[in-house]
């Protein structure tokens, strides 16, 4: 029994890590295999991560962290009963995918302006909490073509647009995602989308 | 919020135990690691030693090993550190603090006064 | 004893910059991360910098942290008169065993 493809880490930065192997062959995970990871750190007790599956030859492992800060530094190891199949080392703080941000809501009743809310995935001592920036995309359910994307590049998780800039009498649909530059996260997965139906009053021509 | 509530000023005599009480709140107790320091009048900080709450491990500073004692109570997600043979140097408010590597979350303080 | 060497006092004027050196050595500041506390008169002190550079939320961007081999730096921007008070780095040593250590601690005097 070999390891095909090492594994690679993503971080939320809160308290999970993912870390995603290859073995040679197809391979019962949760049974043949165990992840041991802990911190580099006084005092720090080892983990034991059991993998699941993800398809025939593909192991996942989801490690619990507590805390997780930058300066955080964990070993890994993969054991196959007695047999240590690989050891390595994962820094979450360079591995970083964002939680998605959630409670999108659409506010439709504020004058021919549509409010774009939504939550941050992070409560306010994490570190993220206020570097999170943000991507809007805006898609029509009648035209593949109306698909638009708005960066929010600024902290408050929101966005206004004027009702106009959509088209009237249609149903759209929304969600979004954040990433955080101050460490060069990947971006976070989508959130749910959330669906209205964009009706505005058509000024009076003079 | 996160939250650390220390115990009330003592004042002992020289070759007595001090137990000082530092009761966490706001978060999950066992998740953090807590820091004793110390601060004597006038002077600057020094580090007493760690726990990590979730299994009750410690760690102590070379200076304080013999005198001090560091435990933690989940059921009431409390640490406590306990100086034994007090002298006059000992004499200083003491800390506890939530972190690891830095310390975002102190206590207000407890003041320890060993006189005669 | 403190092995990592701040200024005893430093002083400027409302308004004005002031910066703060914490000196260390091979075995803390050069192999680990250095933060900042701010300790008010008769209070606990307060983590302003962390991470060499980082700010916690809720510390305003007038105070900035930087580190360069085995020392560092603290820079306070627009002094307020409410900045006055004593100034802690802070790092881990290595050796003999691994610990947290404190710098000697420098008193900020807004003139």
């Known amino acids: 029994m070999k390891v095909l493809q090492e594994p690679t880490c993503v971080s939320d930065y809160m308290s999970i890590s993912t870390c995603e192997w290859k073995m040679n062959g197809p391979t019962n995970c949760s049974t043949e295999l165990r992840l041991l990871y802990q911190l580099v750190f006084l005092l720090s007790e080892a983990h034991t991560c059991i993998p699941e599956n993800n398809g025939g030859a593909g192991c996942v492992c989801h490690l619990l962290m507590d805390d997780v800060v930058s300066a955080d530094n964990y070993t890994l190891d993969l054991w196959a009963g007695q047999q240590l199949l690989w050891k390595g080392s994962f820094k979450p703080s360079e591995h970083v995918k964002p939680r998605a941000p959630g409670n999108l809501t659409v506010h439709t009743n504020v004058s021919d302006t549509l409010l774009l809310t939504w939550s941050n995935p992070y409560p306010p001592d994490n570190y993220l909490y206020n570097h999170l920036t943000y991507a809007v995309n805006i898609w029509s359910e009648n035209d593949p073509a109306d698909f638009r994307i708005y960066n929010v590049t600024y902290l408050e998780p929101s966005l206004r647009i004027a009702a106009s800039t959509l088209k009237s009498g249609i149903s759209y649909r929304a969600r979004v995602r954040a990433w955080a530059q101050c460490y060069n996260t990947t971006w976070s997965e989508w959130s749910p989308s959330t669906k209205w139906h964009n009706s505005y009053r058509e000024p009076f021509e003079q | 919020q996160v939250q650390l509530v220390q115990s009330g000023a003592e004042v002992k005599k020289p070759g007595a135990s001090v137990k000082v009480s530092c009761k966490a709140s706001?978060?999950?107790?066992?998740?953090?690691?807590m820091h004793w320091a110390r601060q004597a009048p006038g002077q600057g900080l020094e580090w007493m030693g760690i726990?990590?709450?979730?299994?009750?491990?410690?760690s102590y500073a070379q200076k304080f090993q013999g005198r001090v004692t560091m435990t933690r109570d989940t059921s009431t997600s409390t640490v406590y550190m306990e100086l034994s043979s007090l002298r006059s140097e000992d004499t200083a408010v003491y800390y506890c603090?939530?972190?690891?590597?830095?310390?975002?979350?102190w206590g207000k303080g407890t003041l320890v006064t060993v006189s005669s | 004893q403190s092995v990592l060497t701040q200024p005893p006092s430093v002083s400027a004027a409302p308004g004005q910059k002031v910066t703060i050196s914490c000196s260390g050595g091979?075995?803390?500041?050069?192999?680990?991360?250095v933060s900042w506390y701010q300790q008010l008169p008769g209070t606990a002190p307060k983590l302003l910098i962390y991470d060499n550079n980082k700010r916690p939320s809720g510390i305003p961007d007038r105070f900035s942290g930087s580190k360069s081999g085995t020392s560092a730096t603290l820079a306070i921007t627009g002094l307020q008169t409410g900045d006055e008070a004593d100034y802690y780095c802070g790092t881990w040593d290595t050796s003999p065993v691994d610990r947290p250590i404190f710098g000697t601690g420098t008193k900020l005097t807004v003139l």
């Open positions: 726990i990590n709450p979730s299994g009750g491990s410690t």
């Open positions: 091979s075995s803390n500041i050069g192999n680990s991360y």
């Open positions: 706001g978060y999950a107790f066992t998740s953090y690691y």
């Open positions: 603090a939530r972190g690891k590597w830095w310390w975002q979350h």
